[in-house]
Interface confidence: low
């Protein structure tokens, strides 16, 4: 089991940028898990007004993303596809500035919505991140 | 190498608390999901919680609403604090990341 593996996404609350794709999960059980927390995330960022449409735009489907990551299907064992760190840079630092900092100072927001760390993931050249998750997000010049 | 070495087991009365520490020689936010597992004597060993790098978590129904997983990414150490413990508990856990595992710390549950 502690391997992880690739099943399809069977969710509601990420299917219109998922679908009924692959995606990496660590256990039988993480899924229906993940879908139930993101879900709550969602009807709590529903209801709150500090969310700009600039950034709920993209904000939305890298949460999903994030919490259900494509399966890379260039592997030889089952291994989860990160999101591309320009693009979370981004969303964190331009798009999302002051929902970020807001998110962030805010513990009862911090307990339901997970928030990636762009520093965690591979720099843009790198081979790790060569078949990175898009989202489309424009580029700043 | 990674290495996992587990630490905060022993001896707690039912109804108490310990804390157990695994802590790895590598970044462990770079695997996908780390957990705790549990071996009883006699018994197989089983999931006890998981956290995936976005913090997503999973617990055993049997210690939901008990116990909490959690990871402290500067100090490259993952967590579980158990709460109300029973004498069920009692077992020997394992820190888990991937196909790598700790050697296991005893926690022992009994009055």
């Known amino acids: 089991e502690e391997d992880g593996f690739c099943q399809p996404y069977r969710g509601i609350a990420c299917a219109r940028f998922i679908g009924n794709r692959t995606v990496y999960m660590e256990s039988l059980h993480m899924q229906g898990e993940i879908e139930n927390q993101i879900t709550a995330a969602f009807t709590m960022i529903g209801t709150s007004s500090h969310l700009s449409d600039k950034c709920s735009q993209f904000a939305i489907p890298s949460l999903c993303h994030y919490a259900f990551p494509y399966c890379d299907e260039t592997s030889s064992v089952p291994k989860p596809r990160d999101l591309c760190r320009d693009e979370c840079e981004i969303l964190e630092n331009v798009l999302c500035q002051t929902e970020y900092i807001f998110a962030r100072s805010n513990p009862m927001i911090l307990m339901r919505l997970k928030l990636p760390n762009c520093e965690d993931l591979p720099q843009p050249e790198s081979p790790e991140a060569a078949n990175c998750i898009r989202i489309g997000i424009p580029m700043a010049d | 190498e990674v290495q996992l070495v587990e630490s905060g087991g022993g001896l707690v009365q039912p109804g108490g608390s310990l804390r157990l520490s695994c802590a790895a020689s590598?970044?462990?936010?770079?695997?996908?999901?780390v957990g705790w597992y549990r071996q009883a004597p006699g018994k197989q060993r089983e999931l006890v919680a998981r956290?995936?790098?976005?913090?997503?978590?999973y617990y055993a129904d049997s210690v939901k609403g008990r116990f909490t997983i959690s990871i402290d990414n500067s100090k490259n150490t993952l967590y579980l604090q158990m709460n109300s413990l029973r004498a069920e508990d009692t077992a020997v856990y394992y820190c888990?990341?991937?196909?790598?595992w700790g050697q296991g710390t005893l926690v022992t549950v009994s009055s």
């Open positions: 590598y970044y462990i936010s770079r695997f996908y999901a």
């Open positions: 888990n990341a991937r196909n790598l």
């Open positions: 956290i995936s790098s976005g913090g997503w978590t």
